[in-house]
Amino acid sequence: LPVNTRCKLEVSNFQQPYIVNRTFMLAKEASLADNNTDVRLIGEKLFRGVSAKDQCYLMKQVLNFTLEDVLLPQSDRFQPYMQEVVPFLTKLSNQLSSCHISGDDQNIQKNVRRLKETVKKLGESGEIKAIGELDLLFMSLRNACV
């Protein structure tokens, strides 16, 4: 069975109303530019076959992908929210740097790979969609990692 190490975020990360609000405002701005409402990145398929105790590790993978492959390429857009939210999410990513899983993470990798492929296939609109789901990313990190 998979064993988790240090897959934990302090609840205080999610108790700062200002940055919570900015994260959600960024998601809203991007979702207004997202026309593809049928596709969901952070949804039922992402969590399928992944037990709750392993979902923090799953969300760590999604967070790192979002930071490196989505937010950095789009960093000039959606200001002033982007310049405030990226450092906050980077801080969460750093706090999860020692979150590992030993054991079978096949389902996790498959689900994350599907999410990445969907974003890449959609091109820039996939990146916009991922930013529009930052509210889901944020809430899923809180739900899984606290």
Partner: antibody, heavy 121, light 111 residues
Framework: EVQLVESGGGVVRPGGSLRLSCAAS????????MNWVRQAPGKGLEWVSG????????DYAASVKGRFTISRDNAKNSLYLQMNSLRAEDTALYYC??????????????WGRGTLVTVSS | QAVLTQPSSVSGSPGQSVTISCTGA?????????VSWYQQHPGKTPKLIIY???KRPSGVSNRFSGSKSGNTASLTISRLQAEDESDYYC??????????FGGGTKVTVLG
């Protein structure tokens, strides 16, 4: 088959306390966020409280914050709601509800039949 | 007082379509992807019919569909049937980590 069975309701005087329980079966309990939702007679639904899979986050409606405490015992497949300083306006049918899928405690896909709480002098 | 605003009632004839709106402040429906819809027949337990704005749980008729635009979410029931007569509630998760419900809409099937 998912089953949620609430118990612990009853008649209590204003200022009194009750502890509601929800016994879960038919699924891996500690994979899901759980919630309490209430419905006053003839009224709409009101979310009361929610807890994530491991009890790390516990959230409350403003109307019950400081009076109600949600908890869970994953070893016993059970969810609880400790209700203190009860008021007449807390009179309602209290439902236990489970997230529709494991990563989504906010979509309430499975509900119990409810337990009735009556606060009356 | 419900934070999300729904019409108290809507009606339609069998075979018609009806749409129920659910309007919130930007801090509720408008900002997020967390909208759900529930059906509740009198004396019965609520039933999830739409989650994640527009997804249908298995076993729910494809006559039910959800959408969202700005601060308003909508539930559309197409090809209305007698058994659709019920109360419908929208809900949204918020940045305050609470779930808000609309006040409910009674759907009446005419005739």
């Amino acid at each position: 088959e998912v089953q949620l069975v609430e118990s612990g309701g009853g008649v209590v005087r204003p200022g009194g306390s009750l502890r509601l329980s929800c016994a879960a079966s038919g699924f891996t309990f500690d994979d899901y966020g759980m919630n309490w939702v209430r419905q006053a007679p003839g009224k709409g639904l009101e979310w009361v409280s929610g807890v994530n899979w491991n009890g790390g986050t516990r959230d409350y409606a403003a109307s019950v914050k400081g009076r109600f405490t949600i908890s869970r015992d994953n070893a016993k497949n059970s969810l609880y709601l400790q209700m203190n300083s009860l008021r007449a306006e807390d009179t309602a049918l209290y439902y236990c509800a489970r997230g529709w899928y494991s990563g989504s405690p906010w979509s309430l896909g499975h509900w119990g039949r409810g337990t009735l709480v009556t606060v009356s002098s | 007082q419900a934070v999300l605003t729904q019409p108290s009632s809507v009606s339609g004839s069998p075979g018609q379509s009806v749409t129920i709106s659910c309007t919130g402040a930007s801090g509720d429906v408008g900002a997020y992807n967390f909208v759900s819809w529930y059906q509740q027949h009198p004396g019965k337990t609520p039933k999830l019919i739409i989650y994640d704005v527009n997804k249908r749980p298995s076993g729910v008729s494809n006559r039910f569909s959800g959408s969202k635009s700005g601060n308003t979410a909508s539930l559309t029931i197409s090809r209305l049937q007698a058994e659709d007569e019920s109360d419908y509630y929208c809900s949204s998760y918020t940045s305050r980590y609470t779930t808000e419900f609309g006040g409910g809409t009674k759907v009446t099937v005419l005739g």
